[in-house]
């Protein structure tokens, strides 16, 4: 969490951003909040990116002002206009790409004063893993697949019964570059599994951590998966 304060003659206002991550090929949100003003027409929101000459986005007098917008962001950005009055200056970014990563500044002017805060935006790819029993294998084998990750993640297997066990000797992980030549498909195979046990396939990079669980019994197979973004620090 980054909290910034305004400077100069006018009073300062508190602006708060949260470091976040964008999944390439999806829309992303860059979070920013500020002390609200009672008049929308008095609020100016400017988003800037380090190393970029033009503005990322500008909103003032209750509407978008995009004449100074950098070409890199043309047609891709939006603030939540109906939420600006309550202090939400968050930016929506369409079709996030690797090149969108960097340091952004959320700069706010209201009748109360000015303030700004920086935001570190990471970009990559992350997806939910799916764990299945591989019936084609000669021994009981589990196959964990996740369609797109970047940067290359680590894959670790764990088991409920053998807690703390190291499965690196009985697993094999491969990374296959996807057609767009950026993200990769992750496939990890775990050998010699036993029934009546729950296994977890954990995939992690510096952006996200995802886990796929599978419980195999003689009568049924239960699956569960979840994903969490890492590094969501507020400023």
């Amino acid at each position: 969490l980054i909290i910034g304060f305004g400077i100069s003659g006018r009073h300062s206002i508190t602006v708060t951003t949260v470091a976040s991550a964008g999944n390439i090929g999806e829309d992303g949100i860059l979070s920013c909040t500020f002390e609200p003003d009672i008049k929308l027409s008095d609020i100016v929101i400017q988003w800037l990116k380090e190393g970029v000459l033009g503005l990322v986005h500008e909103f003032k007098e209750g509407k978008d002002e995009l004449s100074e917008q950098d070409e890199m962001f043309r047609g891709r950005t939006a603030v939540f206009a109906d939420q600006v009055i309550v202090g939400n200056a968050s930016l929506r970014l369409k079709n996030v790409q690797l090149t969108d990563a960097g340091t952004y500044k959320c700069y706010i002017i209201t009748s109360k004063g000015k303030g700004n805060a920086n935001l570190e935006y990471k970009t990559g790819a992350f997806s939910m893993p799916e764990v299945n029993v591989d019936y084609n294998a000669s021994s009981e084998t589990l196959r964990c697949e996740a369609p797109r990750w970047f940067p290359q993640p680590t894959v670790v297997w764990a088991s409920q019964v053998d807690q703390g066990a190291n499965f690196s000797e009985v697993s094999n992980t491969s990374f296959e570059l996807n057609s767009e030549n950026v993200t990769m498909k992750v496939v990890s195979v775990l050998y010699n599994v036993t029934i009546n046990n729950t296994y977890s396939c954990m995939i992690e990079n510096d952006i996200a951590k995802a886990t796929g669980d599978i419980k195999v019994t003689e009568s049924e197979i239960k699956r569960r998966s979840h994903l969490q973004l890492l590094n969501s620090k507020a400023s």
Epitope: E26, G75, T77, A78, N95
Partner: antibody
Framework: EVQLVESGGGLIQPGGSLRLSCAAS????????MNWVRQAPGKGLEWVSV???????DSADSVKGRFTISRDNSKNTLYLQMNSLRAEDTAVYYC??????????WGQGTTVTVSS | EIVLTQSPGTLSLSPGERATLSCRAS???????LAWYQQKPGQAPRLLIY???SRATGIPDRFSGSGSGTDFTLTISRLEPEDFAVYYC??????????FGQGTKLEIK
């Protein structure tokens, strides 16, 4: 040359299924938001489905649960699987690329007629 | 759900005249996510304007877009014979993800 070519349209009975294809050339489908948009005879444009660069999909309420958008990255091709077709699905179906700022590349369209 | 309402439904003008087409949204739309398209009979639509005011590649400068919030305008400064067609505005980003206006037919007077 950047191009989209649709195929797979035709006459189908109500309740039937059809799969539309859209072959792309000159750009990589999986890097863009790819859409299906339809136009009923004498009517306006209606958005049908999107597949994001990530592979996630979304569809209009009118086709949810019946139509499925997908892509084959190795063939650089977009698909629309249409099930439980109704008379009101009769339209010209276009695939279109949204290159961040608008649907800048469209196919020529393929006609789907649902009639008994 | 955002509804885009275009007016007029039909606009009858002569070549050389100025055309002003309106698109009104039922709630605020980001300027970045507002586009205009032209469609001629038997053809696919063509992107004219994106980001409310930026001309797409190859679009003549007689076409211009303006507006913000809920009111957007497409202006054709001096009509050429090939400009007579149907024009659609379109927004991105709300539910449904993409919405088109019902269209304005620009016909020769």
């Amino acid at each position: 040359e950047v191009q989209l070519v649709e195929s797979g349209g035709g006459l189908i009975q109500p309740g039937g299924s059809l799969r539309l294809s859209c072959a792309a050339s000159g750009f990589i489908v999986s890097r863009n938001y790819m859409n299906w948009v339809r136009q009923a005879p004498g009517k306006g444009l209606e958005w049908v489905s999107v597949i994001y660069g990530s592979g996630r999909t979304d569809s209009a309420d009118s086709v949810k649960g019946r139509f499925t958008i997908s892509r084959d990255n190795s063939k650089n091709t977009l698909y629309l699987q249409m099930n439980s077709l109704r008379a009101e699905d009769t339209a010209v179906y276009y695939c279109a690329r949204d290159a961040d700022y608008g649907m800048d590349v469209w196919g020529q369209g393929t006609t789907v007629t649902v009639s008994s | 759900e955002i509804v885009l309402t275009q007016s007029p439904g039909t606009l009858s003008l002569s070549p050389g005249e100025r055309a002003t087409l309106s698109c009104r949204a039922s709630q605020s739309v980001s300027s970045s996510y507002l586009a205009w398209y032209q469609q001629k009979p038997g053809q696919a639509p063509r992107l004219l304007i994106y980001g409310a005011s930026s001309r797409a590649t190859g679009i003549p400068d007689r076409f211009s877009g303006s507006g913000s919030g809920t009111d957007f305008t497409l202006t054709i400064s001096r009509l050429e014979p090939e400009d007579f067609a149907v024009y659609y505005c379109q927004q991105y980003g709300s539910s449904p993800l993409y919405t088109f206006g019902q269209g304005t037919k620009l016909e020769i007077k």
